[in-house]
Structure formats: C-alpha cells, structure tokens
C-alpha cells in the first residue's frame, strides 16, 4: 500500500492510508468536509506560457521498486491529450495552455498496473486538477449596444436601463471578476450606479424638443475598479420619449380663404395648421369652430395624417346674400398631461376670414315646375299662362324665353320670348292627348351659355264635343212565339268626353220609328236601356229582320247625340226559347229585310 506524504500535510490531522501518493503542485492542506479529508488536489496556473510542458505533479505507488515493473495509467478529463503521464515514473504534465474559463476543474483517475500481468497493484485513485485563476478576462457587456428610452422632463434619478457586464474570471477568488461600472460619456445628463449598472437621469428638465438622442458610454472594470483592472465598454443609445409639454400654436392669427358661391356642401376651401413641438399622440390636434357668423355655414375637420384643420362648406353659399364670413377656429390637444397644465391652456385659436366669390349663375325660374290648364276648344294664339325667370347675379342680366322643340315636336305651343307668355299655335283635342309636357328655356341675353330649363305640365280641359255611341255592335233575335214586353237586349253607351259630374245618357227610338214599332225602348236611367217586344208572336216568313234606330243623348252642354241601329232577327225557337233557325224561307218572302221596326 501507499500513503500520501505526511511532510506536506498540515500537522495535527490524522493520516489516511492511500494507495497512490500525489506530490507536486498539490495543495494538501486539509479542508474539512462532512465525510472525509480532501487532499487529492493539484492546482495549476491557467494560461501558462513557458516553453516546456507545465509540470503538474507525480503519482507514486509504494510497490514501485523502480525496476520498471509498474506502469502508471491516467484516465478521465483530458487524459492523454491535455495531461500526459510518464508511464514509468508517474510524472504528470500539462501539454497545452489551460484556460480556467473554458474548464476550471479536471477530474482524473490514476492507476498503477503491473506491466507484466496487467494486474492493478491497488484500486484506481481519483484526483482533481483545479485551474488557478488569473485576471485574463475583461468584463464583457451582454450587449455591444443597448437601446433605451426615458420620458422627457423626468425627475432626476429616473430609471433608464440596467447594463450588465460579466467577467469570465473566478468570482470566488480575488477581485478578478469584481466589476465596477462608471460613465465615460453622457454626463451631466445621466449617471450609473457603480455596483448595479443601473443608468438613471441626472439632469432636470431634459427636453426632447431641445435634444432627443443621447449616446452614453459605460465602462465596466474588474479588480473592483482599481488600477491594473481590465475593462470593457458598451454604448447606450438613449432616446427621450415625448410627453405632452407643448400646446398647439397657430403660426398666424388670421387666415383668409376664398370660395366660389357654387361650392357644394363638403367642399374643402382651405387648410390651417397649428404647430405642436410634441410628437405622436401628443401632437394630435382637434380643430373646432367656436364662434363667428359662419358657425352654421362651415365645418372644420381634422386630417389625421397631416394634423391640419380642413375648412369645408356646410351649407349652400350665396354671394348675393353674404359675401364675407368670419370664423374663430380653435386647435386643441385631445391628450393632455395634467402635470403640464400649469404651462397654460393646451389650445390656441385663430380667425378665419372666408370670402365668397360671385359665380355667373344661370337664370332662376320662379317655380321648379309650372302646371297650366287650357280648354280643348281654345282658339289658336290663346294665352295659357306665363313663366318667369331672373338672373340671380348682381348684374341682373335680361333673359329671353323659348320652348325646347324636342319636347313639342308638333309645335302646338309657343312662348313670348320677352315676357314668357305661353300660347297655343294649334288646336287641341283632349281626347287625343290629355297632358302636354314641354320644357321652357330661359337664356341670359348677354351670355347665351347661361341658360336654365323648367318643365311645363299643360292639362287640356274637357269640352263636350263628342256624342255618345253604342258600346258595341248590337245584333239580337226574337223568338217567333215571343210574348209582348219581353226583354230581348240590353244596350250600353260610351262617350269619349269626360264630364265633371259623370256621364248621363238617355235612350229613345228615333222619331221616324217610334210610331207603329214592333219594339219599344225602355231607358233604365243608369246609362243602359232595354229593347222590349211590343206584341205577341212574330212571323219570320213575313218579316225576318227588323232594324231599330236608337237615339243616344248626353246631358252635357252643348248636348251631343247620335243614332245607332240595332238589328233584330226573328227566329224559330224550341219550347225553352233556344234559337233553332233564323233563316227566312227562300222564294216565299224575297223581301225579308225591313227597316220598319
């Protein structure tokens, strides 16, 4: 068995029997742990720059008689690559520069083996190589460039951002990784807390409108900031964000715009803009008309993109009524920050003068449409009525009138070009056309381009100039065996006229047929009449056909009447009164047709 060399131990602690002895750059001072003593540690300085391999230490078995019978074997982290062992002597060397920040601890296992038999002379022994830190790493910020924002006008000491630098060196040993922050650029506006890296505002009333961007350079230095420490820097780009600390202001107190009187409602007539040094929603402006004679005539809307106030026409303008309007327009911030209200009202007003420009307008008729009436029996050149149009402009240019011939192709009407009197130029007939729709044109004499039109609706009034007549052609029959006073036909009449109180027709046999007639007419007083038999029985061989002349009269003024003929045939009928034959026997009564009813 082998024991760890007592000479290197701190006196006063018991020796623990060990198979392998570790000697060299080991720290064999015992550090007390709960279960055992830790002595199997080598310490190796990182970043060794010597020309030879760095000596780590020696493994030795007490069974080693120095005759080469034992072979020392190393396994574990970096064995055979970073760490090599002389298999005969047990000397361990590091072959490369070691970087603690890459790997701070290597755990290896050592064994002494009988070179001939391969038999281990004692159990495998584990040991640790700890890489001793040197200050070879500067603090590195987590970002090369930080971006941060803080509201303008913030109180001194307002948090802006925290920067963090990390140092890869050992934080548990010395001050190699103890980082202190300082500000290299950015005073007196900002400060940094040396321990935490928190950047705060350091100056009162930092105004974005004065300066928006700040570039702050922060240094992180290890060794607690002392001389010889390594350092790194970062840039912090700080932007002051806007707060509403500026009211809108009109650059001028009065604006003047012109608009033609013909501008329809909604027409933009001008733009006004209040400037606001703020940005974003803090620079949003609402415009309103607060006063002035144009309050009802104009509107103001806000263009959300340009933050301009657009003055628009609200109602129709009339140069002849009012030529100039004065408005008071107010610009205000909708988003107000209460803490800045002490700076004054966040609104401004300006006077807007709107000049209405005269437009040469066409003549205006006194009515939008004219409805006229004329009797259908009116003579040519009868005056129906008149139209009136006036030039609305201040000039009051004279107008002339004409009929649009496209609407009166038959030239039934005419107009006096001077006074607008409408008269007939042809005879009318209500029964042909009840309404005549024509268009009259009024044209400024001095400016024929300025014209306007108006519709004329002319109603033709009825005159009783048509006689009533049968509604249809009547041809009826009578049975030979008919009885007296039997109804054989009902008559109806029509009249093209349209009397105010309705039609009232009267029916009678013509005077020449009234005496000795075989039939009678019975007026029903409801604009119908019936034909009745006057005797019992008719002989078709004696008289096969009767022609009855019927006089129909109306009761209008002047009375109109006409005579219509009803044909009555004598027929042979069955006992139900159904017609069987209406043909006269030929040769017997060659003169079968008679007008004598």
């Amino acid at each position: 068995t082998l024991s760890t060399p007592l000479s290197k131990r701190t006196s006063g602690f018991p020796a623990k029997k060990r198979a392998l002895e570790l000697s060299g750059n080991s720290k064999n001072e015992l550090s007390r742990s709960k279960r055992s003593w830790m002595w199997n540690q080598f310490f190796l300085l990182e970043e060794y720059t010597g020309s030879d391999y760095q000596y780590v230490g020696k493994l030795h078995s007490d069974q080693d008689r120095g005759d080469g019978s034992l072979k020392y074997i190393l396994s574990g982290d970096g064995a055979g690559d970073l760490f090599i062992i002389n298999e005969n002597t047990g000397d361990i060397q590091a072959t490369k520069r070691l970087d603690r920040e890459e790997k701070p601890v290597y755990i290896l296992r050592a064994q002494a083996i009988n070179r001939r038999t391969g038999r281990p002379v004692e159990p495998e022994s584990e040991f640790i190589i700890k890489i001793h830190d040197i200050n070879d790493n500067e603090p590195i910020f987590t970002k090369e460039v930080y971006t941060a924002t803080v509201p303008e006008m913030s109180d001194v000491g307002t948090f802006v951002v925290q920067v963090t630098a990390t140092d890869a060196d050992d934080p548990t040993y010395g001050n190699s990784a103890k980082v202190v922050y300082s500000i290299l650029q950015g005073q007196p506006y900002f400060s940094v807390e040396s321990e935490t890296g928190i950047i705060k505002t350091a100056l009162l009333n930092m105004d974005r409108e004065n300066r928006e961007q700040y570039q702050v350079v922060i240094q992180a230095k290890d060794m607690g900031g002392q001389m010889g420490g390594l350092s790194g820097t970062t840039t912090v780009n700080i932007t002051l964000t806007d707060v509403n600390d500026n009211p809108p202001r009109f650059p001028q107190s009065t604006y003047q715009f012109k608009t033609p009187e013909s501008s329809p409602p909604g027409t933009p007539i001008g733009r006004i803009k209040a400037s606001d040094a703020d940005v974003g929603e803090n620079a949003e402006i609402e415009y309103s008309i607060t006063d002035g004679e144009g309050l009802d005539m104009f509107d103001v809307i806000t263009d959300q993109e340009t933050q301009e106030g657009i003055i628009t026409v609200k109602k129709l303008l009339d140069f002849e009524k009012k030529k100039v309007y004065t408005l008071k327009v107010e610009a205000s911030n909708p988003h107000v920050e209460p803490r800045f209200l002490y700076l004054g009202p966040f609104k401004d007003s300006a006077t807007v003068r709107i000049v209405v420009e005269d437009v040469d307008e066409p003549p205006v008729f006194s009515k939008l449409a004219y409805i006229l009436q004329i009797r259908e029996d009116a003579q040519i050149n009868t005056t129906i009525g008149s139209v009136t149009a006036q030039d609305p402009d201040a000039a009051r240019n004279p107008v002339k009138y004409s009929v649009d011939r496209h609407t009166d192709m038959d030239r039934i009407f005419n107009i006096d070009s001077g006074n607008g009197s409408i008269f007939t130029s042809k005879l009318l007939d209500r029964e042909t056309l009840l309404w005549h729709n024509i268009t009259v044109i009024a044209t400024e004499i001095n400016n024929p381009k300025q014209s306007s039109r108006v519709p004329l609706y002319i109603k033709v009034l009825d005159v009783n100039d048509n006689a009533p007549e049968f509604a249809e052609f009547y041809e009826t029959f009578v049975c030979e065996k008919a009885k007296a006073d039997q109804l054989i036909q009902t008559l109806r009449a029509v009249d093209k006229d349209d009397p105010y109180s309705g039609h009232q027709f009267s029916f009678s046999l013509a005077p020449e047929a009234a005496s000795g007639s075989n039939f009678t007419i019975q007026d029903n007083k409801d604009n119908t009449a019936g034909i009745l038999t006057r005797k019992n029985g008719y002989n078709r061989h004696e008289m096969s056909t009767y022609l009855l002349p019927v006089v129909i009269s109306d009761n209008d003024y002047p009375v109109q009447s006409s005579t219509g003929t009803v044909t009555v045939r004598v027929c042979a009928c069955d006992h139900h009164g159904n017609m069987q034959s209406c043909h006269a026997e030929a040769l017997i009564h060659p003169t079968g047709l008679s007008t004598g009813a």
Epitope: D67, G68, K71, I113, R115, T117, G118, R119
Partner: antibody, heavy 117, light 111 residues
Framework: QVQLQQPGAELVKPGTSVKMSCKAS????????IAWVKQRPGQGLEWIGD????????HNNEKFNFKATLTVDTSSNTAYMQLSSLTSEDSAVYFC??????????WGQGTTLTVSS | DIVLTQSPASLAVSLGQRATISCRAS??????????MHWYQQKPGQPPKLLIY???NLESGVPARFSGSGSETDFTLNIHPVEEEDAATYFC?????????FGSGTKLEIK
C-alpha cells in the same frame, strides 16, 4: 512495427540440450518482457516463463523449473530459452511472445522442436 | 494454478449466425475493476492472435464482430455475424496470477 523472429525448426537427440533464439525489433527491447509458450501438436498452450531484458529478472512456471532456462542478450536484442535433458515429451512448437499487461500482443512464428534418436 | 475450462470443445455455426464460446476460471480473475482474461484465435500453422484483452476490450485491427464480456470467473467470447475466415481454434488466457494459464481451446467450424 514490432517483430519477433524465431528459427523454423530444431532436430535434436534425446538427452541433449537445445538453445532457441527469439530476435526482437520495432520496440525498446529492455522495456518489455519476453515470454515463452509451448504447444504440443493438437494440444493447448502452456506458459513456460518470461524474462525482463532490462534487469534479467525472470518468472517461471514451476512445471518447467528444471527444464527451461531463460536468458537475454541486450546487445543483439535477442532472448534465449535453453531446454535440457530432452525427451520426446519435449517435442513441440515453442513460441516467444511479448506479454503486455498480461496479454500476449505479439508472437513469433514458433520453432518446431523434434526430439528423436 | 488457475484452471480455465472452455466450452464447448467444438461448435459448428452457420455463416452469418452467432458463435458463443464460454470460459470458466477455477477462481476469480478480477481485481479493482480490472478483469484479467484475454482471448486468442489460432489457425493451423500460425501463432495465436490476440482478439480481446481485459475481458471486453477489442484489440486494434480486430473486426468489431468479435466481442467479449464477463467478470470474476465467467467469461464469454461472441462472434456475430460469423464469417468464413473465422474458422479457427479459440483460447482464453488469464494473467491474474502466475503461472499464466490457457484454456484447452474451442474449435469453430463454419457450416
């Protein structure tokens, strides 16, 4: 590369002795052991013993204590095994080999010993 | 002396199949996690060739179809898949103590 060279055959009479050679090359002769192994025709393998050329120290199979003597000549990187009082039982193939941590990683081609009158 | 018993004495395996050879030691050949058992292949007229050392470590240049396992007294050599050229006699050997001893051998035939 490591090589162990042995003569192909030896023919000897009973009762006499024979000294077999094994010439090593391709490694540091004095740093590793040389072992000898016997194999009778159609039989298994028997370890005779080994020698450490760096010191001349030997390990023997007790069965061969009075039969085999192991020596080295470090100047010629050659190991020798002398077999004495030969009988027909000694007729076999004798291999030299390098024992590295208990395993024979390199072997000679073997010398066939025939003991016959 | 430590006696090594190999089984079977011979076996015939089809091409591509698995061959398993066992070696039992009369006492443990393991110490401190190291198993001092080694395996060799010998073809007629040739010296033995090291295949596996320390029970399970493949010697450089030996095909990966050879594998070893075991500890204490029981050890196994596996060949899978078996190839034509694997026809030979296989020996186990211990180096735990002097004298080093070999197993009696297992002859592998390919069907």
């Amino acid at each position: 590369q490591v090589q162990l060279q042995q003569p192909g055959a030896e023919l000897v009479k009973p009762g006499t002795s024979v000294k077999m050679s094994c010439k090593a090359s391709g490694y540091t002769f004095t740093s590793d052991w040389i072992a000898w192994v016997k194999q009778r025709p159609g039989q298994g393998l028997e370890w005779i013993g080994d020698i450490y050329p760096g010191s001349g120290r030997t390990h023997n199979n007790e069965k061969f204590n009075f039969k085999a003597t192991l020596t080295v000549d470090t100047s010629s990187n050659t190991a020798y095994m002398q077999l004495s009082s030969l009988t027909s039982e000694d007729s076999a193939v004798y291999f030299c080999a390098r024992p590295m941590l208990g395993r024979f990683d390199y072997w000679g081609q073997g010398t066939t010993l025939t003991v016959s009158s | 002396d430590i006696v090594l018993t190999q089984s079977p004495a011979s076996l015939a395996v089809s091409l591509g199949q698995r061959a398993t050879i066992s070696c039992r030691a009369s006492e443990s050949v393991s110490i401190h996690g190291t198993h001092l058992m080694h395996w060799y292949q010998q073809k007629p007229g040739q010296p033995p060739k090291l295949l596996i050392y320390a029970a399970s470590n493949l010697e450089s240049g030996v095909p990966a179809r050879f594998s070893g396992s075991g500890s204490e007294t029981d050890f196994t050599l596996n060949i899978h898949p078996v190839e034509e050229e694997d026809a030979a006699t296989y020996f186990c050997q211990q180096s735990f103590e002097d004298p080093f001893t070999f197993g009696s051998g297992t002859k592998l035939e390919i069907k």
